[in-house]
């Protein structure tokens, strides 16, 4: 399944790996590595939504490894001290400071590949990741505001006469719920400590010629629609149909 497109114009590359986890990357093709530093002088920051439980690969500016002196990844996660992973080419020395998450690693040996990978992205990986490449011509940066996306669990049921409840449970960010046809609706959001949000929309249809209603849940991870037939019998429950 394709991950959402980020805010900037770069498209996410998504593929299936042996262990069936999708892998997302914003990395440039090897052929695009530039010798012209002026093209990448500006610090680039990218907002990047990544689905939970996928693998993510984050890349440094496109500078040839032979021109490098040091590569540093700075990782700032909520509620944790800043983690630094550094590689000094001259001494072939790697160094880590305050890095405890074993799922965040170099893709391979940093002298061969400066990319950072997050294996099985979790909610706790929400944060800011920055690669700093030290070259004789200065330092070049690329930063990622990584937003971990969690697909909500969607349910739809009728709980009393001509009233339906649609819930998008534990999504990140909050899902948006809309109805066809529109009814008399009240929406409530419940925030969980892990950063997910449950959205509950309760709708009532007074008009008796409305027999089937559809709940449409919009989310960055994908959209889902469920419909239900409204029963006039008080207290009757009807399970939703997915289409």
């Amino acid at each position: 399944e394709g991950a959402a497109q980020p805010n900037n114009s770069l498209m996410l590359q998504t593929s299936k790996e042996n262990h069936a986890l999708a892998s997302s990357s914003l990395c440039m093709d090897e052929k695009q590595i530039t010798q012209n530093y002026s093209k990448v002088l500006a610090e680039v920051n990218t907002s990047w939504p990544v689905k939970m439980a996928t693998n993510a690969v984050l890349c440094c500016p496109p500078i040839a490894l032979r021109n490098l002196i040091i590569i540093t990844w700075e990782i700032i996660l909520r509620g944790q001290p800043s983690c630094t992973k550094a590689y000094k080419k001259e001494t072939n020395e790697t160094k880590e400071t305050n890095c405890t998450d074993e799922r965040i690693t170099w893709v391979s040996r940093p002298d061969q590949n400066s990319d950072l990978q997050i294996r099985t992205v979790a909610i706790t990986h929400d944060g800011y990741y920055r690669c700093i490449m030290v070259t004789p011509d200065g330092n070049f940066h690329r930063g990622y505001h990584l937003q971990v996306l969690v697909t909500p669990e969607v349910t739809l049921f009728q709980n009393r006469n001509r009233t339906a409840v649609c819930k998008a449970v534990a999504g990140k960010p909050a899902a948006h719920i809309s109805w066809i046809p529109e009814g008399d609706c009240a929406t409530k959001q419940e925030y969980w400590s892990n950063g997910t949000v449950t959205v509950k929309s309760t709708c009532h249809w007074e008009v008796h010629n409305v027999s089937t209603v559809t709940c449409h849940v919009s989310h960055l991870t994908g959209n889902k629609s469920l419909y239900i037939e409204l029963l006039p019998v008080p207290g009757a429950k009807k399970s939703a149909k997915l289409y």
Partner: antibody, heavy 124, light 107 residues
Framework: EIQLQESGPGLVKPSQSFSLTCSVT?????????WSWIRKFPGNRMEWMGY???????VYNPSLRSRFSITRDTSKNQFFLQLNSVASEDTATYYC?????????????????WGPGTMVTVSS | DVQMTQSPSYLAASPGESVSISCKAG??????LAWYQAKPGKTNKVLIH???TLQSGTPSRFSGSGFGTDFTLTIRSLEPEDFAVYYC?????????FGSGTKLEIK
């Protein structure tokens, strides 16, 4: 204790080239560290020129890259600066110096040992 | 290149006084700044690196502070041997760059 000593021509004519030598005692330059050239212009402005590391790799200041080079003679424990197409603006005191290079700190490009400096005047 | 602006250029003080020298970087250099002392007839000496770390052999009356772009070298209770030229140098990125120097003279 590590000691560095610069030597050179003193006076050079414009458009010519010159070479400076840095002799290192108390440490073998192939064993470690980075070995730099720095110059101080009249008026005290300082400019880092470049370095050669223990393995012979060089990193140069981009503003000078096209007309100078740093080399070494490992048998004599010396490293050299060659500056081409000199002008009066190259008149300066030239220093050789060694980077600190701790294993725990990566941005360690400060100079813990310096030579006394050698004056080079470019004049016709 | 990272522009380093040092001030003042000249500073006159008496032994026993305290003085401060400022160094401003043209961009964020984190804490990667060194301070040097230059005296005629002596080799240049690094006093402080990484913004505030005293180099081995530096007297404790010297201290460094700052982060990002603004840094200060403070000398408390000046000794006669402290009168010299002081330079700052950023060691965050290449090319390495120096401040223009501060000459500390006896008043």
């Amino acid at each position: 204790e590590i000691q560095l000593q610069e030597s050179g021509p003193g006076l050079v004519k414009p458009s010519q080239s010159f070479s400076l030598t840095c002799s290192v005692t108390g440490y073998t330059i192939t064993s470690g560290y980075d070995w730099s050239w720095i110059r101080k212009f009249p008026g005290n402005r300082m400019e880092w020129m470049g370095y050669i590391n223990y393995s012979g790799s060089t990193v140069y200041n981009p503003s000078l890259r096209s007309r100078f080079s740093i080399t070494r003679d490992t048998s004599k424990n010396q490293f050299f600066l060659q500056l081409n197409s000199v002008a009066s603006e190259d008149t300066a005191t030239y220093y050789c110096a060694k980077f600190e290079a701790s294993n725990t700190y990566l941005y360690d490009w400060y100079f813990d040992f310096w030579g006394p400096g050698t004056m080079v005047t470019v004049s016709s | 290149d990272v522009q380093m602006t040092q001030s003042p250029s000249y500073l006159a003080a008496s032994p026993g006084e305290s003085v401060s020298i400022s160094c401003k970087a043209g961009k964020n250099i984190n804490t990667n700044l060194a301070w040097y002392q230059a005296k005629p007839g002596k080799t240049n000496k690094v006093l402080i690196h990484s913004g505030s770390t005293l180099q081995s052999g530096t007297p404790s009356r010297f201290s460094g502070s700052g982060f990002g772009t603004d840094f200060t070298l403070t000398i408390r209770s000046l000794e006669p041997e402290d009168f010299a030229v002081y330079y700052c140098q950023q060691h965050n990125e290449f090319p390495l760059t120096f401040g223009s120097g501060t000459k500390l003279e006896i008043k």
